[in-house]
Interface confidence: medium
């Protein structure tokens, strides 16, 4: 931190020069300076490196003899109005004013383009006291000027709540051209015109532009910035850049690659993630997009079966995510799968084909000729059926599932039984008397449970009633049979 050296014998505090690592600023506490008449010119420095221009609160002594005089209007003296210099040079400028000693508490600040300058510059304020006035010179220096230092600088002095403003000092930092717009990489259609833009500024102006294609100049005569280059069309990739020239020299833009759009490369690494009886989930890695975004993809599916007609099923899908669930496939079948994707130019070749299989499915038909009758002596219900005619794709029969629902006044409960594939009959215990029992049967394979047969109902009387007449599966279109015993 910069510390103030306060000694009674010294009328002005003295700040040392730049202190390494000392980057703190003080923007509110103003320094009050004791001042003795007749003290010859002394220097007062602001903290340099951290620095806001010093806006010291200078206590200028009252001179009683001046109290009755008519004071002239206060104004900063005219100074240089325009400074032109090259980037990275140092610059120093000042404003000066003579303030009658009758005034107390003057403050000076520097402003740039309408905003108070808070720091980063070296500002020195010098005081030259005389009998009646104190000449104040506020110097301002910038080391290694940058383009952003361009602008209008003014001094402001606050005195007795009045603000006095100096004439502006315009700083113009000149350097090599500075790009405000450079050409951008593009992907273009073959033999189609496109534009590239290049813009650079000084000062100094003017800035002239030359275009370069694959290291050769395109235009013989320079164009004033900004420049638009119209390229009638390309058949192969090219690299463009622009050169910006002014009186200070030359700046070259980045080189940008102009690519020619083409059809995409085929997808790779088609993978199987999951297979069911009727669907296969696949994913793929997209190929190179040919400098044009993918629009959509096509999944092509062929059944691998000597008896099939070799037709190809095509499923269109979005290009992202790179995944698709192929549906409506046959159970227990082999398929060959390929993927192709398209961009605005066209379709890619098909990916390498991969083989995939669906698993066995559930039966598609229910058991036939279901009959149900009551064996009262054993207090059970006999159920009989015929094995369904299942397709090969449904897989091997592993058994049957029997659903029996018991309904009597106010109650209804369903029970499920599983029996083996060799059975074509089953017996179930009577659960409730004076009730209706509804029976349905489904065939089961490893692929799942098939459809249930149409329901067959039988009435279970109270104990003592005897009847062995069966209930059976109705003929199509008939109402559910109910056998009352």
């Amino acid at each position: 931190a910069i510390t103030e050296a306060r000694e009674e014998a010294k009328p002005y505090p003295l700040f040392p020069g730049p202190l390494p690592g000392s980057l703190q600023t003080d923007h509110t506490s103003l320094l009050s300076l004791p001042h003795t008449s007749g003290y010859q010119p002394a220097l007062m420095f602001s903290p340099t490196q951290p620095g806001r221009p010093y806006t010291g609160n200078v206590a200028i002594p009252r001179v009683t003899s001046a109290g009755s005089k008519l004071l002239p209007p206060l104004a900063f003296k005219h100074t240089v109005g325009h400074i032109i210099l090259s980037e990275h040079k140092d610059v120093k400028f000042n404003c000066s004013i003579s303030v009658p000693n009758i005034y107390q508490d003057t403050t000076i600040s520097w402003w740039k383009d309408g905003k108070e300058l808070l720091g980063a510059h070296h500002a020195i304020t010098q005081f030259y006291p005389d009998d009646e006035v104190t000449a104040i010179i506020a110097s301002f220096s910038i080391t290694s000027v940058q383009r952003s230092d361009n602008g209008s600088y003014i001094c402001k002095m606050k005195i007795n709540n009045e603000e006095i403003v100096s004439d502006p000092i315009y700083i113009e930092v000149q350097g090599l051209p500075h790009f405000t717009k450079q050409p951008e990489s593009m992907n273009v259609t073959r033999n189609t015109a496109f534009n590239l833009t290049c813009q650079a500024v000084g000062p100094p102006e003017p800035v002239n532009i030359f275009w370069v294609q694959n290291s050769s100049r395109v235009n013989e005569q320079p164009e004033k910035s900004p420049s638009v280059l119209t390229v009638p069309g390309l058949t192969e990739m090219a690299v463009f850049s622009c050169e910006a020239h002014n009186d200070k020299g030359l700046t070259v833009s980045k080189g940008v690659q102009i690519n020619i759009k083409a059809i995409p490369s085929p997808p790779t690494e088609v993978s199987i993630h999951n297979s069911t009886a009727h669907s296969i989930l696949i994913s793929w890695v997209p190929g190179f997009d040919g400098y044009s975004p993918f629009r959509n993809c096509s999944v092509q599916v062929k059944e691998v079966d000597p008896l099939s007609n070799g037709s190809v099923m095509i499923f269109n899908t979005s290009a992202s995510p790179h995944m698709y669930q192929i549906k409506q496939l046959q159970a227990l079948a082999n398929y060959s799968i390929g993927v192709s994707c398209m961009n605005e130019i066209g379709w890619s070749a098909v990916s390498p084909w991969i083989l995939a299989s669906t698993t066995e499915g559930a039966p598609s038909v229910a058991p036939l000729n279901v009959t149900v009758f009551l064996n009262e002596s054993r207090d059970n219900v006999d159920i009989r059926w015929m094995k369904p005619l299942t397709k090969r794709q449904a897989g091997e029969l592993v058994g049957y599932r029997i659903s029996h629902v018991w309904q009597s006044a106010g109650i209804s409960k369903e029970l499920l039984e599983e029996v083996g594939q060799n059975n074509s009959r089953a017996q179930i215990s009577v659960q409730v008397h004076n009730a209706t029992c509804t029976v349905r049967i489904a065939a089961v394979t490893k692929g799942g449970v098939g459809p249930f047969s149409d329901p067959v109902k039988i009435f279970i009387p109270a104990h003592g009633w005897v009847d062995h007449a069966p209930s059976s599966t109705p003929a199509p279109g008939n109402a559910d049979p109910v056998l009352i015993i």
């Epitope: 923007h27 383009d113 309408g114 905003k115 300058l117 808070l118 720091g119 980063a120 952003s148």
Partner: antibody
């Protein structure tokens, strides 16, 4: 997409120290001045500190001067605030904020802010 | 330091209303003023800079005006997502913020 992500906040006792970080992405960090702004619970916003793109100009608010140090590492796209001698009144959410332009000696408005990190100073 | 005073401190309004918030500076600040919107638990978002310039991506129902010491933020037709706290900030000197205006649903 411009992103600023603060970290390093937490609970600290009065007199303790903490170092906040701000990771920047989605813009050329080395071309922008950066600031720390804080907000005490249920209160308004208070500017804390400023650092220019090249680190050669730094400003602090009076309330933190001599206790806080701002720094940056342009190679790591990171802004830091070292907070020493912490006081109860430093309890706040600390935001890092990007300055809209780089003009030496001028602080402008803040066009992008991080989500903030909470610093709690309590015994 | 330059002080900014916002009024009102809080405000109740309905969707579709036209709302105006004012910010007064203790000294002239030309047009070096910005407006921010802040929602609970979120960072402030820049709405307006240079007193009247609309930040990119901000809906056109937000507008700013004023110069010198008196500034206003106007929301022409309040939307549900506009209920938040609004702050002004001067940047002619060391940055300072207004105390905030809380905009609530009536």
């Amino acid at each position: 997409e411009v992103q600023l992500v603060e970290s390093g906040g937490g609970l600290v006792q009065p007199g303790g120290s903490l170092r906040l970080s701000c990771a920047a992405s989605g813009f050329t960090f080395s071309s922008y001045s950066m600031n720390w702004v804080r907000q005490a619970p249920g209160k308004g916003l208070e500017w804390v500190s400023y650092i220019i793109s090249g680190s050669d100009t730094i400003f602090y608010a009076d309330s933190v001067k001599g206790r806080f140090t701002i720094s940056r590492d342009n190679a790591k796209n990171s802004l830091y605030l070292q907070m020493n001698s912490l006081r109860d009144e430093d309890t706040a959410v600390y935001y890092c904020a990007r300055d809209e332009t780089v003009v030496r000696g001028v602080i402008n408005y803040f066009d992008y802010w991080g989500q903030g990190t909470l610093v709690t100073v309590s015994s | 330091a330059i002080q900014l005073t916002q009024s009102p401190s809080s405000l109740s309004a309905s969707v579709g209303d036209r709302v105006t918030i004012t910010c007064r500076s203790s000294q002239g600040i030309s047009s070096a003023l910005a407006w921010y919107q802040q929602k609970p638990g979120k960072a402030p978002k820049l709405l307006i800079y240079d007193a009247s310039s609309l930040e990119s991506g901000v809906p056109s129902r937000f507008s700013g005006s004023g110069s010198g010491t008196d500034f206003t933020l106007t929301i022409s037709s309040l939307q549900p997502e506009d209920f938040a706290t609004y702050y002004c900030q001067q940047f002619i000197s060391y940055p300072t913020f207004g105390q905030g205006t809380r905009l609530e649903i009536k």
